[in-house]
């Protein structure tokens, strides 16, 4: 008998996204500076590179929780009935949404812990000391950059709230907790709060990006930074969710 | 059928305390400097203001878990019997203590994460660089302030331990976990450890306050800082708990 | 009826290890500098000393989860049968492995939170400012120490991954979660992932140690630093696990 049958697909998908993002980030953050200016940034691999991978995997998996629902709604609208069977792959996907969500939460928590560990690292300490030295040498009294401060205060705050909501979803997935809820309560948490956390995660990524969309330095070897790729699928899901939420389509779906 | 009936009261109370604390902190931290000296501190809202709200809500909700027990004991002492029905509002409150506790834990965890995120913020980095520059300008070899160091080491440590105990209470609230405990075990954890976490949270707040009680700068527009308001209810609960724990009263309650 | 009978042994062991490590660390970190050079480092007690105790307790308890399995296998190999009853103490120990594991996770989480709190402490801030001042005074442009950066990036990353795996073990210990798993799935997580987390924890400690093994300054009053003592038992367990995993012995055990 197979081990963890419902986890196969989510883990496979997560592993593929993680591997591709890792290689992509490695190329941009480590190999590019090595090739172009002989700068050795291998020390970035254990934390900084990994922590570009984690949010990418997390937000993609979370989008993949809500994408099949969107596809199912479109299929139903196209078929005009809910009695026609879904394709096998969609059926399988629909049944593993809980696992996708839990994996997403797992990666989000890891992302949070890695992020919180940034200022305790020696690399950060040494950089700080060098910045302080440079500030004194330049006789620059005030290091403050207002827009940069705003950017970080907002995206950190949104990230924490998004993670908190994701945690509620994870807790209500514990069998005995979900058993203590009515179906309506469980559905309310999983659908409403889930979309809210996807929305917060997406805004978190967009505010992290801030003005980097138009910063030519971000396009290393003509490749877009990871956050641009990361937000693509969540934005697609959110747009479709919003469209399906429009009164006209909503009525149609409820009729079906 | 209503969604989450047992959560209505705790969420309502939490929302009211959060809103009031938010507005109060906004007044003191943002509006006051803007009105009196045109200082724009809006950047404080997403993290610093929110993180004054979270512990206030958390410790108040935790106090509200143990306050009805105190009131019930006083009512029983007054009535001289345990067979007389409690007033409806007290009954309702008694039945939602678990929810109050879980919400308290939720806000405490958020408070911890927000606090841990402080040093990773750009605002903190820029301040550090400015402080370093100023220290060089002042030709000051040693920045160390002993009492300030002690204050923070103690309150951070107590905060973490308090949160850990609160986490144990939360875990034992998971239905299947509480089902695996005897009633005596469950009651021991919820009552004894609960009061310990309330005590630790209160001491955490008091040591955070340290010498700010007598610092005139803390009283913005004659308003006391949030920690003074925050510790009021927990201290009241702890005092009454201690009084009810006195042998003479304890015997009386056990007789009833 | 006794409270928490299965928790007595693990809590007793944890308390003993914690107390001894606390006293040992106090001697090395606080009493030694006081006695030899009148330096008052009492401020280290609430966080820095405690955070030497926590990982020591955590990794030891985790090793104690897998040590009885090793002893049991050796006993079986010695007896040549699995039908001979284990000694009472080993039996009792085998039955409390779950509690040892959960306690280990509890201490590991505490260790993580204490570690993450380091850079938010005033003591760290003041030290940073002093280092910056000294760097300017020495006119040292670059504070970077490559090997030190590498050491910390690796051990932090491994520590987080180890904690994440330990979290999976803890979650699957929730009754309703373990009930939803087949015996093979549960066993797979608890044995395979458990050993992986012990291995990661040990490597985390060894990389934390780095080149301190041969640093004479580490041997205060001829005593070895805590990490040397901490990794002893986990290494013993891992070596025995590896030996028992050798094809020849593995076949023998499976036959029994």
């Amino acid at each position: 008998q197979e081990l963890f049958p419902q986890w196969h697909l989510p883990i496979k998908i997560a592993a593929i996204i993680a591997s591709l993002t890792f290689l992509y980030t490695l190329l941009r953050e480590v190999i590019h500076p090595l090739a172009t200016s002989h700068q050795q940034y291998f020390y970035k691999i254990p934390i900084l590179v990994i922590n570009k991978v984690l949010p990418m995997v997390s937000i993609t998996l979370l989008a993949l929780v809500y994408l099949p629902g969107v596809i199912a709604a479109i299929v139903q609208l196209h078929n005009g009935t809910k009695y026609k069977k879904f394709p096998h792959w969609l059926d399988k996907w629909m049944l593993t949404r809980k696992q996708f969500g839990l994996l997403s939460f797992f990666f989000a928590v890891l992302h949070a812990i890695y992020s919180l560990s940034y200022p305790m690292r020696r690399s950060y300490r040494y950089k700080l000391l060098n910045w302080a030295y440079q500030q004194v040498q330049q006789n620059k009294e005030d290091a403050w950059i207002e827009h940069d401060v705003w950017r970080m205060e907002i995206y950190v705050s949104l990230g924490i709230v998004g993670l908190a909501i994701l945690a509620l979803l994870a807790v209500t997935s514990i069998p005995s907790v979900s058993d203590s809820l009515t179906w309506r309560e469980f559905h309310y948490i999983q659908s409403k709060l889930g979309i809210v956390s996807l929305l917060l995660g997406t805004i978190h990524a967009l505010i992290f990006a801030w003005n980097k969309w138009i910063d030519i330095k971000q396009f290393v070897w003509y490749t877009p930074p990871t956050f641009m790729i990361a937000v693509f699928l969540p934005i697609v899901v959110l747009i479709f969710k919003s469209i399906l939420f429009l009164p006209c389509l909503r009525k149609k779906i409820l009729k079906i | 059928q209503e969604l989450f009936p047992q959560w209505h009261l705790p969420i309502k109370i939490a929302a009211i305390i959060a809103s009031l604390t938010f507005l109060y902190t906004l007044l003191r931290e943002v509006i006051h400097p803007l009105a009196t000296s045109h200082q724009q501190y809006f950047y404080k809202i997403p993290i610093l203001v929110i993180n004054k709200v979270l512990p206030m809500v958390s410790i108040t909700l935790l106090a509200l878990v143990y306050l009805p027990g105190v009131i019930a004991a006083i009512v029983q002492l007054h009535n001289g019997t345990k067979y007389k029905k409690f007033p409806h509002w007290l009954d309702k409150w008694m039945l939602t203590r678990k929810q109050f506790g879980l919400l308290s834990f939720f806000f405490a965890v958020l408070h911890a994460i927000y606090s841990l995120s402080y040093p990773m913020r750009r605002s903190y980095r820029y301040k550090l660089l400015n402080w370093a520059y100023q220290q060089v300008q002042q030709n000051k070899e040693d920045a160390w302030i002993e009492h300030d160091v002690w204050r923070m080491e103690i309150y951070v440590s107590l905060g973490i331990v308090g949160l850990a105990i609160l986490a144990l209470l939360a875990v034992t609230s998971i239905p299947s976990v509480s089902d695996s405990l005897t009633w005596r075990e469950f009651h021991y954890i919820q009552s004894k450890l609960g009061i310990v976490s309330l005590l630790l949270g209160t001491i955490h707040a008091l040591i955070f306050a340290w010498n700010k009680w007598i610092d005139i700068k803390q009283f913005v527009w004659y308003t006391p800082p949030t920690f003074m308001i925050a510790v009021f209810l927990p201290i009241v609960v702890l005092i009454f708990k201690s009084i009810l724990f006195l042998p003479c009263l304890r015997k009386k309650i056990l007789k009833i | 009826q006794e409270l928490f009978p299965q928790w007595h042994l693990p809590i007793k062991i944890a308390a003993i290890i914690a107390s001894l490590t606390f006293l040992y660390t106090l001697l090395r970190e606080v009493i030694h500098p006081l006695a030899t050079s009148h330096q008052q480092y009492f401020y280290k007690i609430p966080i820095l000393v405690i955070n030497k105790v926590l990982p020591m307790v955590s990794i030891t308890l985790l090793a104690l989860v897998y040590l009885p399995g090793v002893i049991a296998a050796i006993v079986q190999l010695h007896n040549g049968t699995k039908y001979k009853k284990f000694p009472h103490w080993l039996d009792k120990w085998m039955l409390t492995r779950k509690q040892f594991g959960l306690l280990s996770f509890f201490f590991a989480v505490l260790h993580a939170i204490y570690s993450l709190s380091y850079p938010m402490r005033r003591s760290y801030r003041y030290k940073l400012l002093n280092w910056a001042y000294q760097q300017v005074q020495q006119n040292k442009e670059d504070a970077w120490i490559e090997h030190d950066v590498w050491r910390m990036e690796i051990y932090v990353s491994l520590g987080i991954v180890g904690l994440a795996i330990l979290a999976l073990l803890a979650v699957t210990s929730i009754p309703s979660v373990s009930d939803s798993l087949t015996w093979r799935e549960f066993h797979y997580i608890q044995s395979k992932l458990g050993i992986v987390s012990l291995l990661l924890g040990t490597i985390h400690a060894l990389i934390f140690a780095w080149n301190k093994w041969i640093d004479i300054k580490q041997f205060v009053w001829y005593t070895p630093p805590t990490f040397m003592i901490a990794v002893f038992l986990p290494i013993v367990v891992l070596i025995f696990k590896s030996i028992l995993f050798l094809p020849c012995l593995r076949k023998k055990i499976l036959k029994i």
Epitope: E141, W144 | S37, Q39, Y41, N130, Q134, Q138, N139, K140 | -
Partner: antibody, heavy 124, light 113 residues
Framework: EVQLVESGGGLVQPGGSLRLSCAAS?????????WNWVRQAPGKGLEWMGY???????SYNPSLKSRFTISRDNSKNTLYLQMNSLRAEDTAVYYC?????????????????WGQGTLVTVSS | DIQMTQSPSSLSASVGDRVTITCKSS????????????LAWYQQKPGKAPKLLIY???TRESGVPSRFSGSGSGTDFTLTISSLQPEDFATYYC?????????FGQGTKVEIK
């Protein structure tokens, strides 16, 4: 009531030395304040000379070319300004002034209390 | 060093007049991190020590009459006496405490017309 009383001024020959004192009453010089020396040449503006913080660190005006040293005696609650290699252009009224000590929120503070000053005349 | 330039260097006014003194610094005195301008105004009467009137560009020292007000941000600052009183005839100095060395303006002497 905080009071700062300077003393030690007077006539001194060029190249000579002088030590000015500033006795503080009503406040400990080691508490939350830094202490400055400011001078004012006759009919001229104010010139900041240097300061000593509550922790004892000092900072000087670079234009004074290290001829001046600020120190303190905690037991006497007194600040000192040691002046060496005096020149005619050092003729001025010398004030000591108090400012709140540096902190990490507001950084620096203005000088809120001044002594009445002591006149130093450098002349042959 | 930060240069402080006051204008005018002297002015004549009558009791009850509104008097404005300006002070320019060679660089911004605003710390963006705490939104404070590190500029103070002092009043000095002949033979007396200077007295602090305004700090952080606009905050009145306790005991200073409300007719004295400070304004400005960055590099341009103003001290205003809304209604000049006989005791206000003195020399006024601005001072930056944004960094070291502390520097003063050359002073503005307010005389009786």
């Amino acid at each position: 009531e905080v009071q700062l009383v300077e003393s030690g001024g007077g006539l001194v020959q060029p190249g000579g030395s002088l030590r000015l004192s500033c006795a503080a009453s009503g406040y400990s010089i080691t508490s939350d304040y830094a202490w400055n020396w400011v001078r004012q040449a006759p009919g001229k503006g104010l010139e900041w000379m240097g300061y000593i913080s509550n922790s004892g660190s000092t900072s000087y005006n670079p234009s004074l070319k290290s001829r001046f040293t600020i120190s303190r005696d905690n037991s006497k609650n007194t600040l000192y300004l040691q002046m060496n290699s005096l020149r005619a252009e050092d003729t001025a009224v010398y004030y000591c002034a108090r400012e709140r000590n540096y902190d990490y929120d507001d950084y620096y503070y203005a000088m809120d209390y001044w002594g009445q000053g002591t006149l130093v005349t450098v002349s042959s | 060093d930060i240069q402080m330039t006051q204008s005018p260097s002297s002015l004549s006014a009558s009791v009850g007049d509104r008097v404005t003194i300006t002070c320019k610094s060679s660089q911004s005195l605003l710390y963006r991190s705490n939104q404070k301008n590190y500029l103070a105004w002092y009043q000095q009467k002949p033979g007396k020590a200077p007295k602090l009137l305004i700090y952080w560009a606009s905050t009145r020292e306790s005991g200073v009459p409300s007719r004295f007000s400070g304004s400005g941000s960055g590099t341009d600052f103003t001290l205003t006496i809304s209604s000049l009183q006989p005791e206000d005839f003195a020399t006024y100095y601005c001072q930056q405490y944004y960094n070291y060395p502390r520097t003063f303006g050359q002073g503005t002497k307010v005389e009786i017309k």
